[in-house]
C-alpha cells in the first residue's frame, strides 16, 4: 500500500496536498449555515473533486473557495442574548451555568478516574506478561529489542511510570545497565502516547470532530516515533544521553529529596481505590526473575499488614556459608546460621470491590477494561456535549482567541514555548502526561484548540512527565538514587532533544503534518484509526520482538529489506510531489501498483463487509441511548442517533449524487460522507453567557 492512499493517477500539488490524506483536502462545512437545520431537513449535497494542479479539466460546480477542514468550526450561539433576558431568565441561566460547570467537573473527575482504572485493568490483563518481557536477557545487547519492550510493556500496563520504575529497580539491582535502559525509556515514551489515541477513538461519531481529535492525539505518537527514529541510532552510535546524564549525576552531590506531590491522585484515589487496588511490586518482581511472584495476584487483598523483623535459624552446607562467623554453629548433624527475616502478618483487608471475589487477574482485568472504557466513553461524550453547549458565541471566541492567538510581533515565536511550559506545568500538576493529553484530545476535537497549539502543549506534557520522574528519583533510597536519577534525566534529555529536532523550525514540525494526514485518512476510513493503533503499538513492536528473539541475523535479514522499501517509497513520494519530471512516466504516479496497494478503497470494502451487519444491530440499541442522551443535553430535536447510523441511513437512502464524477478522478471525490456534517441544535433555550 502506498503511503498516501487514494492517489489514483493524480499528481499531488505539494502546496495543497502535503497535509492531506491521499492528496485530498475535504471541504469543511460552514457551520454558520447549519444553524437552522433540524432533524427533518436535509441540505443538498455537493460533491467536490479536487483535480491535480497540472490538469486542464474543470468542474461544473466549482466552489469559489475551498474550506480547510482543519479550520476551527464556528460554534454559533443560538440562545437568547443576556441583555434580552428578564431577571427570572438571568437567574435561571446563572444556575444552569453553575449546573453545567458542576456536571463538567463531575464528568471530568470520572474521566480521569476511568483512565486510572483503565491503567489498572491493562496491568491486570498484561502486567505479568509485561514483567516477563523485561526478564529477556537479549535487552542488554539489542537496543531495538529494548525499544519495543519499552513500547509493549507501557502499552500493556498503560503507564510509563510503571515501566520506568521497573527499569530503575532493574538498574539498581545491576540486572540492567543504564545503556541498555535508555532504549526501553524511549519505548516507554512511545507507549504512553497510546492512551490519548484510545481517547480520540471515542470521538469517532462525528467525522470532522474525529479528524481533529485523532490528529491531535496522534501528533504525540508521531513526535515520539520520529524522535526515536532519529535519536536511537544517534544514542547507539554516540551514547550522548548516557554520557551527559552520567556527568550530571556525578557532578552533583544529591541529597534524597521528597516525593513529587500527588495533586490529582489525592482527589481521584479515594474513588479508584474503592474499585480496585493493585500490588504493583509483583510486576517488578517478575521482571527481576522472582519465580514466586509469577503465582502472585496483582489484586491487593491485604492493605494493613504488620511487618515483624526476626532472626531465624537456617541450615547451611558448611560453616563457610555462614552470614557471619559469630552466628555460625552446629547441632551435631547440620551447620546452622542466623538469618534476618521479615515476617508479614495480615491485619486488615483492602476495601475494594474485588477483594473477596478471588477471581483470576485476567477476569478482573477484563471486567475493569470493559467498564473503564464504557465510563471513559460516556464521560467523554458528556464532556464534549457540555463543552459544546457552553462554548458558543462570545465564550468560544474568547477562549479560542486566548488559547490559539500568538503574541504580537516580534514575540510571536515565544507563544509556542510558553505553551510548552504550560503543558509541562499542567502535567506536573496532574502527575500524568496521559491524563493531560487525554483531556486535551476532546478540546481539539470540538475545535477549542488547534493542532498547531496542541502540539507544543503535548511536547510540554512530555517534559512535565520527566520532571515528575526526576523528583521521584530524588526521593529514592540511597542505593537507587543514582540509577533512578540518571534514567529520569535520560528521559528528560531525550524529550528535550526531540523538541529541538521537531519544534523550533516550523519546517521541521513533521508530526503536525503527519498527524493531519492520518486524521484525514481516519476521518474518511474510520476503521483505519483502529488499524493504525494495532499496527503501531502492537504488531510492529511484537514483530521486532519476535525477530529479535530469533537472533540479530534474522532481524537484519528481514529489517533491512523492509527499511529499504520504506525509504524507496518515501523518496519516490517526495520526487512525485516535488519534481515528477525527473521520474519516468510510469513512476510519476502509483498507478503501476494494483489498486489494493495504493488505495484504501478495496480494504474499506472488505472492512465494511465485516462491520456491516454489526453496524445494523448496534444502531437499534444506540438510538435508544442517544435519545436519552439528547434529553439530558437539552436538545430534543438532535436525535439522529450516532454518526455511524447516520452514514448507514444515507447509504440506504442513496442520497449521494455527485455533480460530476469523471472515472479518472473517482477516488479523490469528496462526498458529504467525508465532511461529517452534524445538524446543529435549534433549541432557543440555549444559555451560554454566565
Amino acid at each position: 500500500m502506498a503511503p498516501w492512499p487514494e492517489l489514483g493517477d493524480a499528481q499531488p500539488n505539494p502546496d495543497k496536498y502535503l497535509e492531506g490524506a491521499a492528496g485530498q483536502q475535504p471541504t469543511a462545512p460552514d457551520k454558520s449555515k447549519e444553524t437552522n437545520k433540524t432533524d427533518n431537513t436535509e441540505a443538498p449535497v455537493t460533491k467536490i473533486e479536487l483535480l491535480p494542479s497540472y490538469s486542464t479539466a474543470t468542474l461544473i460546480d466549482e466552489p469559489t473557495e475551498v474550506d480547510d477542514p482543519w479550520n476551527l468550526p464556528t460554534l454559533q450561539d443560538s440562545g437568547i442574548k443576556w441583555s434580552e433576558r428578564d431577571t427570572k431568565g438571568k437567574i435561571l441561566c446563572f444556575f444552569q451555568g453553575i449546573g453545567r460547570l458542576i456536571l463538567l467537573l463531575g464528568f471530568l473527575y470520572f474521566f480521569v478516574c476511568s483512565l486510572d482504572i483503565l491503567s489498572s485493568a491493562f496491568q491486570l490483563v498484561g502486567g505479568k506478561m509485561a514483567g516477563q518481557f523485561f526478564s529477556n536477557s537479549s535487552i542488554m545487547s539489542n537496543p531495538l529489542l529494548g525499544l519495543v519492550i519499552g513500547v509493549l510493556v507501557t502499552v500493556l500496563v498503560q503507564s510509563s511510570s510503571t515501566s520506568t520504575s521497573i527499569v530503575v529497580s532493574m538498574v539498581s539491582s545491576s540486572l540492567l545497565t543504564v545503556r541498555a535502559a535508555i532504549p526501553i525509556i524511549m519505548g516507554a515514551n512511545i507507549g504512553t502516547s497510546i492512551t490519548n489515541t484510545i481517547v480520540a477513538l471515542m470521538q469517532v461519531g462525528d467525522r470532522s470532530e474525529f479528524r481533529r481529535a485523532f490528529a491531535g492525539a496522534t501528533v504525540h505518537d508521531f513526535f515520539n516515533w520520529l524522535s526515536v527514529l532519529v535519536l536511537l541510532p544517534v544514542e547507539v552510535a554516540t551514547h550522548y544521553l548516557e554520557i551527559i546524564t552520567q556527568l550530571i549525576v556525578e557532578s552533583f552531590h544529591f541529597k534524597n529529596g521528597e516525593d513529587a506531590p500527588d495533586l490529582l491522585k489525592v482527589i481521584t484515589k479515594p474513588f479508584t481505590k474503592l474499585i480496585v487496588q493493585l500490588d504493583k511490586k509483583v510486576i517488578s518482581q517478575i521482571a527481576m526473575n522472582d519465580e514466586k511472584a509469577k503465582n502472585k495476584s496483582l489484586v491487593k487483598i491485604w492493605c494493613k499488614t504488620f511487618t515483624n523483623k526476626t532472626q531465624i535459624n537456617v541450615t547451611v552446607p558448611s560453616t563457610a556459608n555462614c552470614t557471619s562467623p559469630s552466628l555460625c554453629w552446629t547441632d551435631g548433624i547440620q551447620n546452622w546460621t542466623m538469618k534476618n527475616v521479615t515476617y508479614k502478618e495480615n491485619i486488615a483487608k483492602c476495601q475494594h470491590i474485588f477483594v473477596n471475589f478471588h477471581l483470576p487477574d485476567l477476569a478482573v482485568g477484563t471486567i475493569l477494561l470493559i467498564l473503564s472504557l464504557l465510563v471513559l466513553c460516556g464521560c467523554l461524550i458528556m464532556i464534549v456535549k457540555i463543552l459544546g453547549s457552553v462554548l458558543k458565541g462570545q465564550v468560544a471566541t474568547v477562549i479560542k482567541k486566548t488559547i490559539n492567538t500568538d503574541f504580537p510581533f516580534p514575540f510571536a515565536w515565544l507563544t509556542g514555548y510558553l505553551a510548552i511550559l504550560v503543558g509541562a506545568g499542567m502535567t506536573f500538576i496532574v502527575q500524568s502526561s496521559s491524563v493531560f493529553t487525554s483531556a486535551l484530545t476532546p478540546l481539539i476535537g470540538i475545535g477549542v484548540i488547534t493542532i498547531e497549539r496542541a502540539y507544543p502543549l503535548t511536547l510540554g506534557s512530555n517534559i512535565g512527565t520527566t520532571t515528575t520522574a526526576i523528583l521521584a528519583a530524588l526521593a529514592s533510597p540511597g542505593n537507587a538514587l543514582r540509577s533512578s536519577l540518571q534514567i529520569a534525566l535520560c528521559h528528560f534529555f531525550f524529550n528535550i532533544s526531540g523538541i529541538l529536532l521537531w519544534y523550533p523550525i516550523p519546517f521541521t514540525r513533521l508530526p503536525i503534518r503527519m498527524a493531519k494526514g492520518l486524521g484525514n485518512i481516519s476521518a474518511k476510513y474510520r476503521w483505519f484509526a483502529v488499524f493504525y493503533l494495532i499496527i503501531f503499538f502492537f504488531l510492529i513492536p511484537l514483530t521486532v520482538f519476535g525477530l529479535s528473539l530469533a537472533g540479530w541475523r534474522v532481524l537484519v535479514g528481514v529489517g533491512v529489506p523492509v527499511v529499504f522499501i520504506i525509504i524507496l517509497v518515501l523518496c519516490l513520494r517526495l520526487l512525485q510531489s516535488r519534481c515528477p519530471r525527473v521520474l519516468p512516466k510510469k513512476l510519476q504516479n502509483w498507478n503501476f501498483l494494483p489498486l489494493w496497494m495504493r488505495s484504501l478503497k478495496p480494504w474499506d470494502a472488505v472492512v465494511s463487509k465485516f462491520t456491516g451487519c454489526f453496524q445494523m444491530r448496534c444502531c437499534c440499541c444506540c438510538r435508544v441511548c442517544c435519545r436519552a442522551c439528547c434529553l439530558l443535553c437539552d436538545c430534543p430535536k438532535c436525535c439522529r442517533c450516532s454518526k455511524c447510523c447516520e452514514d448507514l441511513e444515507e447509504a440506504q437512502e442513496g442520497q449521494d449524487v455527485p455533480v460530476k464524477a469523471p472515472e479518472t478522478f473517482d477516488n479523490i471525490t469528496i462526498s458529504r460522507e467525508a465532511q461529517g456534517e452534524v445538524p446543529a441544535s435549534d433549541s432557543k433555550t440555549e444559555c451560554t453567557a454566565l
Epitope: 535459624n313 541450615t315 560453616t319 552466628l327 555460625c328 554453629w329 547441632d331 551435631g332 548433624i333
Partner: antibody
Amino acid sequence: QVQLQQPGAELVKPGASVKMSCKASGYTFTSYNMQWVKQTYGQGLEWIGAISPGSGETSYNQNFKVKATLTADKISSTAYMQLSSLTSEDSAVYYCARAARAEGWFAYWGQGTLVTVSA
Amino acid sequence: DIVMTQSHKFMSTSVGDRVSITCKASQDVGHAVVWYQQKPGQFPKLLIYWASTRHAGVPDRFTGSGSGTDFTLTISNVQSEDLADYFCQQFRSIPLTFGSGTKLEIK
C-alpha cells in the same frame, strides 16, 4: 517429663561388639537429635556422633567413624549405638543425650551405660 | 578439630566466695560455647549455653561470659552443693568438643 533410659552396664569380651540402647519418652522422638558421648577418666568427655531419628541422618566424630554405628527405631522411640571390635580402650561410660534441632547443647542426658571390655 | 582447653584441673574455694573457671578455644567459636556441671556419679547437667544464657532452673549465681576464644564461668557466693566437675563445650563446628574439665573443691 523427658526421660532417656539406658541399661546400667555391659560386659563384653575384646574383639566383640555391643549394641546399647537409649529409650526416649516424654517427647516426640523424631523431633530431636540424639547425641552420644563417651566419658573416660583419662580422656574426659568425647562426642561420638549424632542421629536425627526423623530422617535417619547421622554425623560422626572422625575418631569414632569406624568404631560406632548409630541407628534409631521410630516405633519403639529407641536410639541405638553399636560399638564394634572392642578393646580395653573402649571401656567407658556412654551417654545418650537429647538436643533440639539447631541446638548444639544437651539439656537432657541418659544415666549412662558403663561398658567394660574384659577377657 | 577445635580444641577446648581448661587450664585449671582443680580449683579450690570457700563457701560464699566467688570463683571463675576459664576455658580457651583453639580458634574463634563466636558465642557457641556451653557449660556443664557434673557431680560425682551423675550425668552432666546443662548450666549455660550460647556462652552466657542460663538454662532453665539454674541458679543466678552461675554466670557465663566471653566470646571468640576466651570464656569464663563465674560462680558467685559458692555453695557446698557446687562441689563438682565443670566442663565447657563448643558447638561451632563438627566434631563437638569438650574441655578436659575443672574440679571445684570446697575448702
